[in-house]
């Protein structure tokens, strides 16, 4: 239904707290360099204005669209051009072009310092002094670093943060209570961020149809007892929610997500037997819980799908009459039978089926032609299964750090032109797949591994798009989203690459490395490893292991030495010489 005042409508639906949080996220995601105080001021102004519209929907400007209202606010910020350069040009445009322009200027890799967590005492003090401001800072800092973070989900993580602080700040040992809990939230939030960015990429590059196909596959796996009409309805609603969030329409997105959660909880009987626990929770927890609810028990004795999709003489007629519905039904039937497959694999199978029908239905004897589709699926299914087996075996042998290093070597060889920080970030993230997925039961490994890898590789593509340097990466990133992971897996050593010359300073370390946290030490060592591979792309695993072991030994020795500086300055050059010799 149409509302006289959109802003009043959203304020009423969402309530003041969520309204303010979402507006803060929206502004922080659009203008990523502004300080918290600048944004907080704008949020307060917008909220005050929303309240006047709630009191009187006919008041001046209350009938304006949210894009107009928010865009006008952003464009009124002083020194916009000095701080944001050409983003200020967006303000010369009219809606909807102005909002599109803002979206195009979102930076996936803003040059902001890493979000440092204050020490426990300081954190608890500022939280107790003003919990609202404290949580506002959290939303601002996460949103500006992750400009496509799923806004209603960020409110959920802020709520988690709040609950952890409330609990731990009352403990005697605040530090040991806070650290593991906040680390857990941070890890989950980072994964949520790359997953959502993937969804937005799908929407931006391939449109709603591509996202809806993703949603049909995912929902069919989770709700195998729901019928096709129900899955289609859920997929349509979920597509709308994600389109809004990816498009910066965060109030509408959060409101529609709440509506979708309400619908699911009111229709459990036709959706899934596993929803009740989620539906008993308050809004943010409920929506989060529904988004990762366990798969419903699959109905036993589902028939083979060949009857409808291969053996039926009417296949081509059914396909021609309603292509998207027929393919959607195929995807639904395949996905509900295969919770053990990744969504990416299911979409590749549907794509192969579509291509087969396009080809075969134009031939003289279509059934003879599409009758072989089953055999054509075999390599598509076996490739990711082998990938999971090989990589999980390697992870179990090497552990997370060693596995990251193996991936780092592999990816530096595939795309040595990519910057070392990007390669290290990618390898570290890709390597976490082992810890995240390889410990799961067999039938959950493939979906976990492949869908996570796809999301990480999407980030690699986004970063590479800004400064394209590798033809290998460009090739894999310009294809369809579901083909990316197999494309990257199939890449081999880039034979066109001219090795980097050996620079001693790249491998020169100082005693300050000894006091770094373990994670930072690892990054330093992995940076050196990537540089070694760039110097010798065809170095064997043995050679690289020798050098890295020597390097680890050197760090261990010098960090334990009484005079660390002397040890680093005398032993360092020896290490460099040994490295050069080992790789010669």
């Amino acid at each position: 239904e149409a509302h006289k005042s959109e802003i009043a409508h959203r304020y009423n639906d969402l309530g003041e707290q969520h309204f303010k949080g979402l507006v803060l996220i929206a502004f922080s995601q659009y203008l990523q360099k502004c300080s918290y105080d600048e944004h907080a001021k704008l949020v307060q102004e917008v909220t005050d204005f929303a309240k006047t519209c709630v009191a009187d929907e006919s008041a001046a400007n209350c009938d304006k669209s949210l894009h107009t209202l928010f865009g006008d606010k952003l464009c009124a910020i002083p020194n916009l051009r000095e701080n944001y350069g050409e983003l200020a040009d967006c303000c010369t445009k009219q809606e909807p072009e102005r909002n599109e322009c803002f979206l195009q200027h979102k930076d996936d890799n803003p040059s902001l310092p890493p979000f440092e967590r204050p020490e426990a005492e300081a954190m608890c003090t500022s939280f107790k002094e003003n919990p609202t401001t404290f949580m506002g800072h959290y939303l601002h800092e996460v949103a500006r670093r992750h400009p496509y973070f799923y806004a209603p989900e960020l409110l959920y993580y802020a709520e988690q943060y709040n609950e952890i602080l409330t609990q731990c700040c009352a403990e005697a040992d605040k530090e040991s209570c806070l650290t593991p809990k906040l680390d857990g939230v941070k890890e989950k939030a980072l994964v949520s961020s790359v997953r959502q960015r993937m969804k937005c990429s799908s929407m931006q590059k391939f449109g709603e149809r591509a996202f809806k196909a993703w949603a049909v596959a995912r929902l069919s796996q989770t709700f195998p007892n729901a019928d096709f009409a129900e899955i289609t309805k859920l997929a349509t609603d979920l597509t709308k929610v994600n389109k809004e969030c990816c498009h910066g329409d965060l109030l509408e997105c959060a409101d529609d997500r709440a509506e979708l959660a309400k619908y699911m909880c009111e229709n459990q009987a036709t959706i899934s037997s596993k929803l009740q626990t989620c539906c008993d929770k308050p809004l943010l927890k409920k929506a989060h819980c529904l988004s990762e609810v366990e798969h419903d028990t699959m109905p036993a004795d589902l028939p083979a799908i060949a009857a409808d999709f291969v053996e039926d003489q009417e296949v081509c007629k059914n396909y021609a009459e309603a292509k998207d519905v027929f393919l959607g039904t195929f995807l639904y039937e395949y996905s509900r039978r295969h919770p053990d497959y990744s969504v990416s694999l299911l979409l590749r199978l549907a794509k192969k089926y579509e291509a087969t029908l396009e080809k075969c239905c134009a031939e003289a004897n279509p059934p003879a032609c599409y009758g072989t589709v089953l055999a054509e699926f075999q390599p598509l299914v076996e490739e990711p299964k082998n990938l999971v087996k090989t990589n999980c075996d390697l992870y179990e042998k090497l552990g997370e750090y060693g596995f990251q290093n193996a991936i780092l070597v592999r990816y530096t060889q595939k795309a040595p032109q990519v910057s070392t920080p990007t390669l290290v970030e990618a390898a570290r993230n890709l390597g976490r797949v082992g810890t995240k997925c390889c410990t799961l039961p067999e039938d959950q490994r493939l979906p976990c591994v492949e869908d996570y890898l796809s999301a990480i590789l999407n980030r690699v593509c986004l970063l590479h798009e800004k400064t394209p340097v590798s033809e290998h990466v460009t090739k894999c990133c310009s294809g369809s989203l579901v083909e990316r992971r197999p494309c990257f897996s199939a890449l081999t050593v880039d034979e066109t690459y001219v090795p980097k010359e050996f620079k001693a300073e790249t491998f020169t370390f100082h005693s300050d490395i000894c006091t770094l946290p373990e994670k930072e030490k690892q990054i330093k060592k992995q940076t050196a490893l990537a540089e070694l591979v760039k110097h010798k792309p065809k170095a064997t695993a043995e050679q690289l292991k020798t050098v890295m072991d020597d390097f680890a030994q050197f760090l261990d020795t010098c960090c334990k030495a009484a005079d660390k500086d002397t040890c680093f300055s005398t032993e360092g050059p020896n290490l460099v010489t040994r490295c050069k010799d080992a790789l010669a």
Partner: nanobody
Framework: EVQLVESGGGVVQPGDSLRLSCAAS????????MGWFRQAPGKEREFVSA????????YYANSVKGRFTISRDNSKNTVYLQLNSLRPEDTALYYC?????????????????WGQGTLVTVSS
Amino acid sequence: EVQLVESGGGVVQPGDSLRLSCAASGGTFSTYVMGWFRQAPGKEREFVSAISQNSIHTYYANSVKGRFTISRDNSKNTVYLQLNSLRPEDTALYYCAASRFTSWYTADYEYDYWGQGTLVTVSS
């Protein structure tokens, strides 16, 4: 981890019958689709027959339709394949396989667990 052990193979003459059994352990048998595949010397492995969890659906390769019958007993964690009117071309190593998740029933790549096989030889 599901373990499958086939039995019942042997040497028979054309036209004779055999009953193959496959005993499963280590999983909830009633949640698995069960299948039989065979591999003749020098040939690729091929689908023979499959049965759904509660025996509602059964599937057969065209070459065995009307001669072979698949059945299962969930209380005994066992699947059977009755082979009648055997022919020399039925000579092969017969494998039992289990799948939690299948769209086709006939695709070997959808089966996660396999037995070692039992040999059937049909010869005059």
